[in-house]
Amino acid sequence: VPLSRTVRCTCISISNQPVNPRSLEKLEIIPASQFCPRVEIIATMKKKGEKRCLNPESKAIKNLLKAVSKERSKRSP
């Protein structure tokens, strides 16, 4: 991973584009920390394992988060 101690945040760019929950392998929500003062959302896609930084402020991404958490709550007993 191209990472040095001076890199504070993971996302160089962020995407507003809606992501189909079915195409998601994993969704990571990285809370703000001493290293990066903002929330970062990283989607790992099933296709080729591509990772995409998402815009936490985007309406489409907020809807995605809701859909994913709803799906999780359905699965958990």
């Epitope: 191209p2 996302c11 760019s13 990772k51």
Partner: antibody
């Protein structure tokens, strides 16, 4: 359509300064990392600097560290390159380029939109 | 620092022929960090391939990328007149820095 337009190039004497600008349109500028890439006459491409979408990180090629500063004003959709202590070897076409949507340190989507470039000539 | 080497320096081919361009890295590069660009005289570069093998938006399917580790390839299956240009590979490496190869010129035989 997505567009980047550079300005600010010109002829300058060694040791002097110059500020390049790059104005973006057709996309949400504040969402994308931005780069400066240069090309000396008859030579290949050389990456110069990058700035994260929110300005949180900035990185430079070794040859310009301490002399060049990349910055951005998201309210004006504009990217800047402040160039100090210019040298003859800085003579080049300077392009600004957009980092692809969603790029991060774990996956790189390439520089997907480029300006037409502005020419900087450092000469006595 | 990773150094990229491209070969051949110049490739002389005719329209309709297949072009195979090589990009070799001095150390292993994750395919997630490898891109290819095309540049025509007097024009800005254009992104062709990212992630070693994914075509950028609007790029015709005659362009394909492959490879892993230290060896990567850009293939143009059937050269069209507009494909004669210089091609650069590029990697995103630690620090982080974004290094370009020296380029391969594809010209008309």
């Amino acid at each position: 359509q997505m567009q980047l337009v550079e300005s600010g190039g010109g002829v300058v004497q060694p040791g002097r300064s110059l500020r390049l600008s790059c104005t973006a349109s057709g996309f949400t500028f504040s969402n994308n990392g931005m780069h400066w890439v240069r090309q000396a006459p008859g030579k290949g491409l050389e990456w110069v600097a990058v700035i994260w979408f929110d300005g949180m990180n900035k990185f430079y090629v070794d040859s310009v560290k301490g002399r060049f500063t990349i910055s951005r004003d998201n309210s004006k959709n504009t990217l800047y390159l402040e160039m100090n202590s210019l040298r003859a070897e800085d003579t080049a076409i300077y392009y600004c380029a957009r980092e692809g949507d969603g790029s991060g340190i774990y996956y790189y989507y390439g520089m997907d939109v480029w300006g037409q470039g502005t020419t900087v000539t450092v000469s006595l | 620092e990773i150094v990229l080497t491209q070969s051949p320096g110049t490739l002389s081919l005719s329209p309709g022929e297949r072009a195979t361009l090589s990009c070799r890295a001095s150390q292993s590069v994750s395919s997630s960090y490898l891109a290819w660009y095309q540049q025509k005289p007097g024009q800005a570069p254009r992104l062709l391939i990212y992630g070693a093998s994914s075509r950028a938006t609007g790029i015709p399917d005659r362009f394909s990328g492959s490879g892993s580790g230290t060896d990567f390839t850009l293939t143009i299956s059937r050269l069209e007149p507009e494909d004669f240009a210089v091609y650069y590979c590029q990697q995103y490496g630690s620090s982080p820095i974004f290094t370009f190869g020296p380029g391969t010129k594809v010209d008309i035989k």
